[in-house]
């Protein structure tokens, strides 16, 4: 018969912070490995040292752990315009970012592309460019915002969403077209 584990035994089998349960013996709590190292061998018994080894070049662990392998260092995505802000060390992953006057656009949770901050030509800066957000522009009269650039209302077609902003110009263009066909 397998004895039923009481509340006290359950509590005892949960290790304190900084330790983990030995995978083969849940009565033993082993000390976790420091960041920059990984688990080579579990501790042989209570109060005995865990065998931790330093991560090899090109790999890291950023927090205390009991991982059997270090994590591979990230590579900055050159095709996304990313640059290396700081290189990978045994206890910290590569930090990638963008150049000056660029911002990050996140395509997915872990993938960003660097784009140039809009200069707001034919408009004014409403909000400055930030690390993860493009400049927010307000366009001058006779211009409308398209993909964060101020475009002349002469490029506003009726089907586009610029018609309200460019209504007087649209009417003028329509009038010119009508007078040209009579």
């Amino acid at each position: 018969l397998v004895p039923h584990l009481g509340d006290r035994e359950k509590r005892d089998s949960v290790c304190p912070q900084g330790k983990y349960i030995h995978p083969q013996n849940n009565s033993i709590c082993c000390t976790k490995c420091h960041k920059g190292t990984y688990l080579y061998n579990d501790c042989p018994g209570p109060g005995q040292d865990t065998d931790c080894r330093e991560c090899e070049s090109g790999s890291f662990t950023a927090s205390e752990n009991h991982l059997r392998h270090c994590l591979s260092c990230s590579k900055c995505r050159k095709e996304m315009g990313q640059v290396e802000i700081s290189s990978c060390t045994v206890d910290r992953d590569t930090v990638c970012g963008c150049r000056k006057n660029q911002y990050r656009h996140y395509w997915s949770e872990n993938l960003f592309q660097c784009f140039n901050c809009s200069l707001c030509l034919n408009g004014t800066v409403h909000l400055s460019c930030q690390e993860k957000q493009n400049t927010v522009c307000t366009c001058h009269a006779g211009f409308f915002l398209r993909e964060n650039e101020c475009v002349s209302c002469s490029n506003c077609k009726k089907s586009l969403e610029c018609t309200k902003l460019c209504l007087p110009q649209i009417e003028n263009v329509k009038g010119t077209e009508d007078s040209g066909t009579t």
Epitope: H105, Y106, S108, E109, R146, E147, E161
Partner: nanobody
């Protein structure tokens, strides 16, 4: 409430084509950049393609460049992905999402199977 509903997946032979659609609601679709991501069995999410708000600028992962085309119809609140010259490695569940945002909203995805 944000809703994204992908469709158009199916079984296709290598070299074949499929057109995926993503019907969006609950947010101002026309103002948002959109993206397609995929997840092959047992693998992580992979970014496929993205498109700016008005569809002028489009972006592709190197693995699909020249074969896939992303487009959108803002009047229908719909995002598309035309996939040509499909390969075995394109087999995955495809999801659409708002890009540049917190990625909290996902549809159920649409499964693309590439097999002879």
């Amino acid at each position: 409430e944000v809703q994204l509903l992908e469709s158009g997946g199916g079984l296709v032979q290598p070299g074949g084509s499929l057109r995926l659609s993503c019907a969006a609601s609950g947010f101002t679709f026309g103002d948002d950049w959109m993206t397609w991501v995929r997840q092959a069995p047992g693998k992580g999410l992979e970014w496929v393609s993205g498109i700016a708000a008005y569809g002028i600028s489009t972006y592709y992962a190197d693995s699909v460049k020249g074969r896939f085309t992303i487009s959108r119809d803002n009047s229908k609140n719909t995002l598309y992905l035309q996939m040509n010259s499909l390969r075995a490695e394109d087999a995955a569940v495809y999801y659409c999402a708002e890009s540049g945002k917190v990625f909290d909203y996902w549809g159920q995805g649409t499964l693309v199977t590439v097999s002879s």
